[in-house]
C-alpha cells in the first residue's frame, strides 16, 4: 500500500478537486493514473460494496453508490449500516451486550404492539445448533438469552413448501393443500412444481396464512419471501411483499426489513417474514456434515447478527418478538443407497415422485387416475427383499400421526423410506449423493431449529420439542389476534410466554353419559354365547352379581382405574353409559354395541413373565346392557377372518374370579385374527414390561372409526356405510394410551406432578404384511410395529371424540403440552 504520509481519502471520495500530500488523488480516474491516496481502495471503493461500517468509513462523506451509510447524518437520514452505532459511536454491540439488560419490554414511542419477525433458515437441522455453536455467535446468543426447543418437529413430508406453509397456517399439508414441492391435482388437472408459474395459482393454496390473519384484523404484514406470499390467497396479497429472487444478498434482505420497521406508524407492518435458502442449498450440494454447510452457517449467522444489530440501533432489540426456525433438517444420501423400482417390476407403467418421500400414481392422468390399481402396486412392493429399505403403504394405512392421507393430491401409494436411502424409478436417476430431506419426521436428521427472543418470550429457557403446527397459534397470541381454525392446539405453547395471552380451558362434554344399571343377575338373552365353566344358573348369577358394585366399590375402582378422570365424550348424540368393574371401567357406546373406551391400571408387577392364558371359550352376556344394544357371539362365526378381542385383557386379574368380569360381551371388540396376534402379545408381554419399567401404567384403549381417513372420528352414517353383512362395525384402528408418572417413585394413581404418555394408534388390518412377519416370532416384530404407530394423545382425541385428563389437577396449558407431546425413540442422527 502507498505510504500513509501521502494523505487520506477520508471524506474526499470521488472529489475531483482534492489534492492530498504529494498530490495524491481520490477521484474515479486515480487508479488508471496510479496516483490514488493510500486508503482509496478501503475508503472509497470497498465502502460501496459492504454492508458494515469500519474505521475508514465512520464519518464518511455520503457516497451515492454505497449500500448503507456511515456518515454523521445517517441516523437522521435513516440509512445507517446496521452496526453504525457500535462501530462509529462506541456503543456495545448486540452480540457483546449482556442478556440481562433485556429485562422488560422496551418499545420506542409508536410501537404499541411488539412486532413479530418470523425468520426461516431453510434446512437448518437442530443438531447444527449444538455441533457448530461456536461458529454461530449471533444465533448462539439468541439461544442463550432467549428461549429455544431441543428441536421443532417438521410435518411429513419434510420438504420446504409443505412445511413453510404449515408454519404460517397451523395446518397439516393434507389440510392446506401443499402436500409436496411437486404434485398433481386431478380436479385441477394441473401439476404444481417450484419451477412453474402454476405455483402462483391460488387454487393450490388453502387455509389462511398468518399475513392474512393479521391483515383481516387490521394489522399490516410484510413478507421478504415465504412460500405462498406471492399468491392471491383468498384474493389477497401481504401488505408488502417481495417477488422471490434467490440472488438477492442476505444483507439486502435484512436491510429492507429494517427499513420497513422505520416506516411511519400508520404504514408500518406488525408481522414480518424473512427467508434464507441456506443452509439447505449447501446441505443438498455437499451433505449435512461438510465444509460447505459450515460456511453457510457462518454466512446466515452473520446476516442474522446484522438484523439484531440493526434492531438494537433502532432500540427494537428488546421490543421485537423474533422467531428463528427452520422448515426441516437434512440427511446425507449415497449413490449406493438407492432402491430402484425396476428391481420390483418388469416394466414401470406408473408415474413416481422419486426421492426420500416417494409417491406412485397412474401415468396417464386424468384418464387412469381413479382406476389405477394402487393395492396391486403395494402388494408387489411388500416384503420382497430381506433388506428392503422402504416400506410401501396405501396412504390411509400410514401412521395416523403423519396426517398425510386426506387430500386428492396425496397419491394412494406411498413409500416410507429408510434414512439416507432414496427410492427411484430406475438406474437412469443419478440424482444422489450430497444431502436430502423429506423423510419420516421422527428421524433426528429431519429435526428443525426453533429459537425465540423478545418481550413476550421467557428468557434463558430450553423447552421440550413440539410440532411446527403449533407456531401459527403462538404468533397469533404474540399479535393478540384471533387465529383461523387450524390443526394446532392453542395454549399448548403457553409455557414459552412470560404472560400467556390465551387461557385454555377443558372442552365441554357434548354427550352426557348414564350408568348402565344392574337390574337382574340373569340375562334375558344369552346372545348365542357359551361358557362351559359356568355350569348352572347359580354360578352364572354369582359371577354376574360381581358386576353389581356398591358405591364404595365404584369410588375405589374409579380412584385406581380412572386416576385422571373419565374420558369426556365430545361427539354429538352419542348414547353411552359407564360400566364399573373392580379392575376396569369402560364407556359403552350403545349405537356401536361395543365399548368406546376401557380404562384400567396395571401395577408394577414383581414378575415380568407373560400373563397366563385367558379362560378359553367363555363368553356371556352383560346383564347391564340390553340385548338390543349388545353384540352377539354368533357374529363371530359369520366371518372366518374376524374374531373377538378384549379391550380389558381378562388375564390381568388380581383374583381368580375377577377374570369373569372381563369375559362379557360389553368388553368385546371385533378383531382380525392376524391383528389379534399383535394385540395379545402387546397385552401379555409388552404391557407388563411397561408397567414394570414405569412403576405401573394406566391404560385407556378403544376402537377408532376413520373410514374416510381424515384423522377425525367418523359420523355414524359414514360408519354405517362400512358395516358389511352384520350389525357390528369393524374399527379401522385401535388406540392404546399408556400413562404413568414422570417421577417413577409414584404410581399413576398417586402422581403429584407431570405425567408420561405413550399413545398408540394401530391400524386394524386383516394381515400383518406391514411387518413382514413370515416365520418370525412376535418378539421380533410387534414392538417395532407398535413403535411405528406411536401418536399424540391429541391424535387419539381427534379420532375418538374423547377428551382425556380432565380431572388431573394441573393447569390446562400443561395438560395440552402433554396431549401434543409425541414420544420418540430415535437415537442416532
Amino acid at each position: 500500500r502507498k505510504l500513509e504520509k501521502q494523505g487520506s481519502c477520508r471524506k474526499k471520495c470521488f472529489d475531483a478537486s482534492f489534492r492530498g500530500l504529494e498530490n495524491c488523488r481520490c477521484d474515479v480516474a486515480c487508479e488508471d493514473r496510479g496516483d490514488c491516496c493510500w486508503d482509496f481502495e478501503d475508503t472509497c471503493v470497498e465502502s460501496t460494496r459492504i454492508w458494515t461500517c469500519n474505521k475508514f468509513r465512520c464519518g464518511e462523506t455520503r457516497l451515492e453508490a454505497s449500500l448503507c451509510s456511515c456518515s454523521d447524518d445517517c441516523l437522521q437520514r435513516k440509512d445507517c449500516c446496521a452496526d453504525y452505532k457500535s462501530v462509529c459511536q462506541g456503543e456495545t454491540s448486540w452480540l457483546e451486550e449482556n442478556c440481562d439488560t433485556a429485562q422488560q419490554s422496551q418499545c420506542p414511542e409508536g410501537f404499541d404492539l411488539p412486532p413479530v419477525i418470523l425468520f426461516s433458515m431453510d434446512g437448518f437441522r437442530a443438531e447444527y445448533l449444538y455441533t457448530w455453536d461456536t461458529l454461530m455467535p449471533n444465533i448462539n446468543k439468541l439461544k442463550t438469552c432467549g428461549i429455544h426447543s431441543k428441536y421443532m418437529r417438521a410435518m411429513y413430508p419434510t420438504k420446504t413448501f409443505p412445511n413453510h406453509y404449515t408454519i404460517v397456517t397451523g395446518l397439516y399439508p393434507e389440510s392446506h393443500g401443499i402436500i409436496d414441492n411437486n404434485m398433481y391435482d386431478v380436479n385441477l388437472n394441473k401439476n404444481f412444481s417450484l419451477s412453474s408459474e402454476e405455483q402462483n395459482n391460488p387454487a393450490w393454496w388453502h387455509g389462511q396464512p398468518m399475513w392474512l390473519t393479521a391483515m383481516y384484523q387490521g394489522l399490516k404484514a410484510a413478507t421478504y419471501f415465504w412460500p405462498g406470499s406471492e399468491v392471491a390467497i383468498n384474493g389477497s396479497f401481504p401488505s408488502i411483499y417481495m417477488p422471490y429472487n434467490r440472488s438477492v444478498p442476505y444483507e439486502e434482505r435484512i436491510s429492507t426489513l429494517l427499513k420497513w420497521l422505520d416506516l411511519p406508524k400508520a404504514e408500518r407492518p406488525s408481522f414480518y417474514t424473512m427467508y434464507f435458502e441456506e443452509p439447505d442449498s449447501s446441505g443438498h450440494a455437499s451433505g449435512p456434515v461438510s465444509a460447505r454447510v459450515i460456511k453457510a452457517l457462518q454466512v446466515v449467522d452473520h446476516a442474522f447478527g446484522m438484523l439484531m444489530e440493526g434492531l438494537k440501533q433502532r432500540n427494537l432489540h428488546n421490543c421485537v418478538n423474533i422467531i428463528l426456525l427452520a422448515d426441516h433438517g437434512m440427511d446425507q444420501t449415497y449413490c449406493n443407497k438407492m432402491e430402484y423400482m425396476t428391481d420390483y417390476f418388469p416394466r414401470i407403467n406408473f408415474y413416481m415422485y422419486e426421492g426420500p418421500a416417494p409417491r406412485i400414481r397412474a401415468l396417464n392422468v386424468p384418464h387412469d387416475f381413479f382406476s389405477f390399481n394402487s393395492e396391486e402396486i403395494v402388494r408387489n412392493l411388500s416384503c420382497r427383499k430381506p433388506d428392503q429399505h422402504f416400506k410401501p403403504y396405501l396412504t390411509p394405512d400410514l401412521p395416523k400421526r403423519l396426517h398425510y392421507a386426506k387430500n386428492v393430491r396425496i397419491d394412494k401409494v406411498h413409500l416410507f423410506v429408510d434414512p439416507q436411502w432414496l427410492a427411484v424409478g430406475s438406474k437412469s436417476n443419478t440424482n444422489c449423493g450430497g444431502g436430502n430431506h423429506g423423510y419420516n419426521n421422527e428421524f433426528r436428521s429431519m429435526e428443525a431449529i426453533f429459537l425465540a427472543h423478545g418481550p413476550s418470550f421467557k428468557e434463558k429457557t430450553e423447552v421440550e420439542p413440539f410440532e411446527n403446527i403449533e407456531v401459527y397459534n403462538l404468533m397469533c397470541d404474540l399479535l393478540r389476534i384471533q387465529p383461523a381454525p387450524n390443526n394446532g392446539t392453542r395454549g399448548s405453547l403457553n409455557h414459552l410466554l412470560k404472560v400467556p395471552f390465551y387461557k385454555p380451558s377443558h372442552a365441554e362434554e357434548v354427550s352426557k353419559f348414564s350408568v348402565c344399571g344392574f337390574a337382574n343377575p340373569l340375562p334375558t338373552d344369552n346372545l348365542s354365547c357359551l361358557c362351559p365353566h359356568l355350569q348352572n344358573s347359580i354360578q352364572l348369577e354369582q359371577v354376574n352379581q360381581m358386576l353389581n358394585l356398591t358405591q364404595e366399590e365404584i369410588t375405589a375402582t374409579v380412584k385406581v382405574n380412572l386416576p385422571f378422570g373419565r374420558p369426556r365424550v365430545l361427539q354429538k348424540n352419542v348414547d353411552n353409559c359407564l360400566l364399573y368393574h373392580r379392575e376396569y371401567v369402560s364407556g359403552f357406546g350403545k349405537a356401536m354395541r361395543m365399548p368406546m373406551w376401557s380404562s384400567y391400571t396395571v401395577p408394577q408387577l414383581g414378575d415380568t413373565s407373560p400373563l397366563p392364558p385367558t379362560v378359553p371359550d367363555c363368553l356371556r352376556a352383560d346383564v347391564r346392557v340390553p340385548p338390543s344394544e349388545s353384540q352377539k357371539c354368533s357374529f363371530y362365526l359369520a366371518d372366518e377372518n374376524i374374531t373377538h378381542g378384549f379391550l380389558y385383557p381378562p388375564a390381568i386379574n388380581r383374583t381368580s374370579d375377577s377374570q369373569y368380569d372381563a369375559l362379557i360381551m360389553s368388553n368385546l371388540v371385533p378383531m382380525y385374527e392376524e391383528f389379534r396376534k399383535m394385540w395379545d402379545y402387546f397385552h401379555s408381554v409388552l404391557l407388563i414390561k411397561h408397567a414394570t419399567e414405569r412403576n405401573g401404567v394406566n391404560v385407556v384403549s378403544g376402537p377408532i372409526f376413520d373410514y374416510n381417513y381424515d384423522g377425525h372420528f367418523d359420523a355414524p352414517e359414514e360408519i354405517t356405510k362400512h358395516i358389511a353383512n352384520t350389525d357390528i362395525p369393524i374399527p379401522t384402528h385401535y388406540f392404546v394410551v399408556l400413562t404413568s408418572c414422570k417421577n417413577k417413585s409414584h404410581t399413576p394413581e398417586n402422581c403429584p406432578g407431570w405425567l408420561d404418555v405413550l399413545p398408540f394408534i394401530i391400524p386394524h388390518r386383516p394381515t400383518n404384511v406391514e411387518s413382514c412377519p413370515e416365520g418370525k416370532p412376535e418378539a421380533l416384530w410387534v414392538e417395532e410395529r407398535l413403535t411405528a404407530h406411536i401418536a399424540r394423545v391429541r391424535d387419539v382425541e381427534l379420532l375418538t371424540g374423547l377428551d382425556f385428563y380432565q380431572d388431573k389437577a394441573q393447569p390446562v396449558s400443561e395438560i395440552l403440552q402433554l396431549k401434543t407431546y409425541l414420544p420418540t425413540f430415535e437415537t442416532t442422527i
Epitope: 383481516y216 389477497s236 404504514e267
Partner: antibody, heavy 116, light 108 residues
Framework: QVQLQESGPGLVKTSETLSLTCTVS????????WSWIRQPPGKGLEWIGN???????NYNPSLKSRVTMSVDTSKNHFSLKLISVTTADTAIYYC??????????WGQGTLVTVSS | EIVLTQSPGTLSVFPGERATLSCRAS??????LVWYQQKPGQAPRLLIY???TRATGIPDRFSGSGSGTEFTLTISSLQSEDFAVYYC??????????FGQGTKVEIK
Amino acid sequence: QVQLQESGPGLVKTSETLSLTCTVSGGSISSHYWSWIRQPPGKGLEWIGNIFYSGSTNYNPSLKSRVTMSVDTSKNHFSLKLISVTTADTAIYYCARHDHVWFDPWGQGTLVTVSS
Amino acid sequence: EIVLTQSPGTLSVFPGERATLSCRASQSVSRNLVWYQQKPGQAPRLLIYGASTRATGIPDRFSGSGSGTEFTLTISSLQSEDFAVYYCQQYNNWPPWTFGQGTKVEIK
C-alpha cells in the same frame, strides 16, 4: 346461490333515523362479513360499515358516530341504522357480502331520500 | 385513509378499440385492489381482484395490472356491453375500505 335484498322506507326526514334491513337468501348469514355501501345519485361509492355474523363490526370513521349495525342469524338478515340524517345522506344504499377483500354479491340497492 | 384517484373521469372510445383506465393510490396497497363495473340502474359487478386476477365469468378482454400505487384496467376491444362506469377499490388498509371516484367509459 346467495342473493341479497334491501328493504326499508324510501323517504326519511332530516334529523331522523334511517333504518334498512338486508335479507340474505340462498345461503347462511353465518361465517361471512356483510357490508353496507351507499352511492349518492350520480356519484361514487362509499363503504359504510360491515358486521360479522357474531355481531362484531367495523364502521367507516367518517360515519362512525352515527352508524349502528346489527345481525339476526335466526332470520338470516342484518340491519343498518343511521341517526341524525341530513340531505347529504340521500343515496342508493346497497348491502353486499364481504370477506375482507371484495364486495360480491350485491343487493339491487334501495334509494333513500332525505327530505327536509 | 387511503385515497384512490381514478383517471380520466370520462373516457370516450369507439367500439372495438382499446380502453385504458388508471387508478392511483395515495400510498402502497400492495396488489390488494379490485375493479368493478357498474351499469345504470344496477349494482356494481366484480371484474378483477388481486390487481390482475379475473373473477369467474369475466371475459379475457378485461385485464388488470400494477402494484404498489399505480394500477391499470385494460379493455382490449370494447364491446357495446362494456360501456359503463368502472370503480377501483383497495383492501390493503382498512377500515375503511375505499373506492375510487369512478371512470365513465362512453361511446365515442
